[in-house]
């Protein structure tokens, strides 16, 4: 009989608005009053097993207490009516749970998309965490009809998709109503016709095909989605070459409206692209769909649109009335060569004399010439046909080469090694600049580059090492040879020296001593020696430090105390810093020479 | 209350063109398909083509070559040309309205309602 | 071109009794058949649209039934004024819209 429960509490499953205050009764049973000998006097009120503070209670009368809590700040709140029976030990009468949380707010931010093939998804902002169940139902209408509403799942409380087949072309009205125990709110209602809401299937079976006509373009056709037939379509095509990150975009206005081919123009020749296709409504309402798979193709060849770089190099050592000459050519970048290079044609012909043709596979030709003067000429050949000619003046044995470039200089700049100079007064055909490393411990293996006689400034595009010495030679090429070389010595960028000095004496004298040492090799100089510092101190005073010009191999320490033990180390500088040589004593005499104690 | 009213000549010589306009009254054209339909002496229906009044047309595919729907907005009309007529022509010809509305189910379309509003029909004869 | 297939092609009934059209489809319409009714000399006059909604101002006593490529028209109470040709419509967008061949219904 006592299992049945001494009281209750009122109201049994309350839930409450979290800040709010709150009021619980508990009203005891006759039957438990008589068997324990109580009233309400004798109730005790607990929240998650602590007792409440008697000032929060209320007797109303001989069988009810009630408690009220101000400001309720705990989601969830364990209440419980206990009374004090016999020797002060309490019983339970009943408990509650008070769940506490907050109503929904009004859902903002109500969009809806169709994914063609699928049925409409709406999504919203469903506001605040309330900390309370809360159901959100997306209804939706027409003028005559009333659709069945979607009930958001759990898991995606702020999305609901319908299931009802979209209808095209019939406004919908489409809202939101969020409710808990709390309250219920209904957002703002949107009207739309779905066909703008749409985002399409991507265009599919993308494909490229090339034209033998003509080298620059490229077809592109593809299968346009099934949504084709209710609207109509815009598109983005985008292209790259293949090693490219970065899409270019075929202007939108040529593809504003449906179709399932477009031929892409201004390509470069014998070059891979790949393609991707987009496409939406028209009119720019609904959305994009995603990209096609992507497609590549190649473009056809064309005739290479340069003629090589050309140069030449005579060997020095000479028979009597011939000479080695080592004709040389760049092999052309792709976007020049514009196809698969099968060959090179050279043609010497001796002045006003007969001609000799060379077909070469290789990027040089080695002949041996006459003293007198040549006229070499060379193109290159690919399927298609054959570059411009790039023709060379090789001037005769006694040729004397005249006006050199002016005020050269070379300089690093965003890690390249820049070469500038003044152009001579004289019509240049081109200019040939050739670099190599200075090395004590290799010949100096030279790399060339051609430059189009309008130029006064590049770089040097080979494969470049920092902290080595480059000699770069500029050469101008006149219609009847080369002029004049010029040369300079640069660093793409300097650092210290790897290793510093070796200092040594001389001579030594009682007060003086003249330090000598050999200029650091070139292979450790690692940039230009801007400096010296000697450091010399005896055993027991202060460092001295003495700075010395990089063109001096010598250096006199005046002022020295006789009969002393010096140590003496040398640094030498570039522009990125120093390194100190070993450390070198030596002691000055007593006496200086001839001298008597 | 819409009503609609087909207009032209009962008879057309062969290898000419037939041509029926029809004229929509006591409504908008506006938001809706504007269809022909025809029907030959005893036997049933057969879709012409439609227009919109944005000037989309769809046409019978056994009949695509020959025909041509276009829509005058502002006299409220839409008009049918079929060239190159013959004997097998010879039919009821039915103007009729199609409510917009295109349901979508996985990637098929299909109109949502049906023909809701035709006119009479006008009697076309092909003969020399 | 889906083709629509109507059964029986004419048929026999009295005021009063139930009746039952049927409509095939070549392949799936989904639930996109219409139904019209057509009296001699006359323009035909839309029934049912979506295979089950009845157009505004028709009789409850037509209905419409169906999914994918099997439909019916049922009239439930035969009246005298349904005596006509009834005809089923499939609605797929793509060309062409294609009629069933016709079911006439007499007097018995």
């Known amino acids: 009989e006592l299992l049945d429960p001494c009281g209750y509490i009122s109201p049994e499953s309350p839930v409450v608005q979290l800040h709010s205050n709150f009021t619980a009764v508990c009203v005891l049973k006759e039957k438990c009053m008589d068997y324990f000998h109580v009233n309400a006097n004798y109730i005790v009120w607990k929240t998650n097993h602590f007792t409440i503070p008697k000032e929060q209670y209320t007797i109303i009368n001989r069988t009810a207490s009630s408690v009220t809590f101000t400001d309720i700040a705990s989601l969830n709140i364990q209440l419980t009516c206990n009374i004090l029976t016999f020797g002060q030990l309490e019983q339970n009468v009943y408990g509650i749970t008070i769940i506490s949380g907050l109503p929904p707010e009004k859902p903002k931010n109500l969009s809806c998309i169709v994914n063609e093939g699928k049925k409409m998804r709406c999504e919203w902002d469903g506001g605040r965490e309330t900390h309370l169940e809360t159901n959100f139902t997306l209804k939706s209408e027409w003028a005559t009809h009333k659709f069945a509403d979607c009930k958001a799942k759990r898991d995606t409380p702020t999305s609901c998709t319908v299931d009802y087949s979209t209808v095209y072309f019939v406004n919908i009205e489409v809202w939101v109503e969020a409710e808990n125990a709390l309250g219920k709110v209904t957002s703002d209602h949107i009207n739309f016709d779905p066909v703008y809401k749409v985002k399409p299937n991507p265009p599919h079976n993308l494909s490229v095909i090339n034209s033998e006509e003509l080298s620059s373009i490229l077809k592109l056709t593809w299968t346009n989605p099934s949504i084709k037939s209710v609207i109509i379509l815009k598109y983005n095509i985008q292209y790259r070459t293949k090693d490219a990150s970065t899409w270019s975009q075929i202007p939108p206005e040529d593809t504003a409206s449906t179709r399932s081919s477009f031929t892409v123009q201004d390509l470069k020749p014998f070059t891979e692209y790949v393609f991707r296709i987009r496409c939406m409504k028209e009119d720019g309402k609904g959305y994009w769909s995603d990209w096609s798979e992507e497609a590549s193709g190649i473009t056809y060849e064309d005739r290479p649109s340069k003629a090589p770089s050309f140069w030449y190099k005579i060997d020095p050592s000479h028979t009597q009335g011939y000479r080695t000459v080592q004709l040389v050519w760049k092999t052309l970048p792709p976007f020049e060569a514009n196809g698969k290079i099968l060959d090179y044609e050279v043609t010497l012909t001796r002045w006003k004399s007969h001609l000799q043709n060379y077909t070469v596979n290789a990027t040089k030709l080695t002949v041996n010439l006459t003293n007198d003067r040549y006229l070499a000429t060379l193109t290159v050949r690919n399927l298609v046909g054959k570059s411009d000619a790039a023709v060379l003046t090789i001037p005769a044995c006694d040729f004397q080469a005249t006006h050199p470039v002016m005020d050269l200089k070379a300089f690093p700049k965003d890690n390249m090694l820049w070469v500038e100079w003044t152009t001579p007064r004289e019509s240049v055909k081109k200019y040939i600049l050739e670099w190599c490393v200075l090395s004590d411990k290799a010949p100096c293996i030279t790399d060339w580059q051609q430059e189009d006689g309008t130029v006064h400034r590049t770089y040097l595009r080979g494969n470049l090492a920092e902290s080595k010495c480059y000699l770069i030679t500029v050469t101008p090429v006149y219609a009847d040879g080369p002029g004049s070389p010029e040369s300079i010595k640069a660093y793409l960028k300097q650092a210290p020296p790897s290793k510093g000095p070796t200092v040594r004496t001389k001579k030594v004298g009682k007060n003086e001593a003249v330090l000598e040492w050999d200029q650091l090799p070139v292979d450790v100089q690692n940039g230009f020696i801007r400096n010296y510092t000697i450091f010399y101190r005896t055993i027991i005073g202060n460092e001295t430090a003495v700075n010395v010009d990089s063109s001096h191999t010598e250096y006199t320490l005046s002022s020295l105390t006789s009969d002393t033990l010096y140590m003496v180390r040398m640094a030498a500088y570039t522009d990125e810093g120093g390194k100190d040589g070993p450390e070198f004593t030596f002691t000055t005499p007593k006496f200086a020479q001839g001298e008597i104690e | 209350q819409v009503q609609l009213q087909e207009s032209g000549p009962g008879l057309v010589k062969p290898s000419e063109t037939l041509s029926l306009t029809c004229t929509v009254s006591?409504?908008?054209?506006?938001?809706?398909?504007w269809t022909w339909i025809r029907q030959p002496p005893g036997k049933g229906l057969e879709w012409i083509g439609h227009?919109?009044?944005?000037?989309?047309?769809n046409y019978n595919p056994s009949l695509k070559s020959r025909v041509t729907i276009s829509v005058d907005t502002s006299k409220n009309q839409f008009s049918l040309k079929l060239t190159s007529v013959t004997a097998a022509d010879t039919a009821v010809y039915y103007c009729?309205?199609?409510?917009?509305?295109?349901?979508?189910?996985?990637?098929?379309?299909?109109?949502?309602?049906?023909?809701?509003?035709w006119g009479q029909g006008t009697t076309v004869t092909v003969s020399s | 071109d889906i083709q629509m297939t109507q059964s029986p092609s004419s048929l026999s009934a009295s005021v009063g009794d139930r009746v039952t059209i049927t409509c095939r489809a070549s392949?799936?319409?989904?639930?996109?058949l219409n139904w019209y009714q057509q009296k001699p000399g006359k323009a035909p006059k839309l029934l049912i649209y979506?295979?089950?909604s009845l157009q505004s101002g028709v009789p409850s006593r037509f209905s419409g039934s169906g999914s994918g490529t099997d439909f019916t028209l049922t009239i439930s109470s035969l009246q005298p004024e349904d005596f006509a040709t009834y005809y089923c419509?499939?609605?797929?967008?793509?060309?062409?819209?294609?009629f069933g061949q016709g079911t006439r219904l007499e007097i018995k």
């Open positions: 006591g409504g908008s054209i506006s938001n809706y398909y």
């Open positions: 979506a295979a089950s």
């Open positions: 392949q799936s319409i989904s639930s996109y």
């Open positions: 009729a309205r199609l409510p917009l509305g295109i349901a979508a189910v996985d990637t098929d379309y299909y109109y949502y309602f049906g023909m809701d509003v």
């Open positions: 227009i919109s009044n944005s000037g989309t047309t």
């Open positions: 419509q499939q609605s797929y967008s793509t060309p062409p819209i294609t």
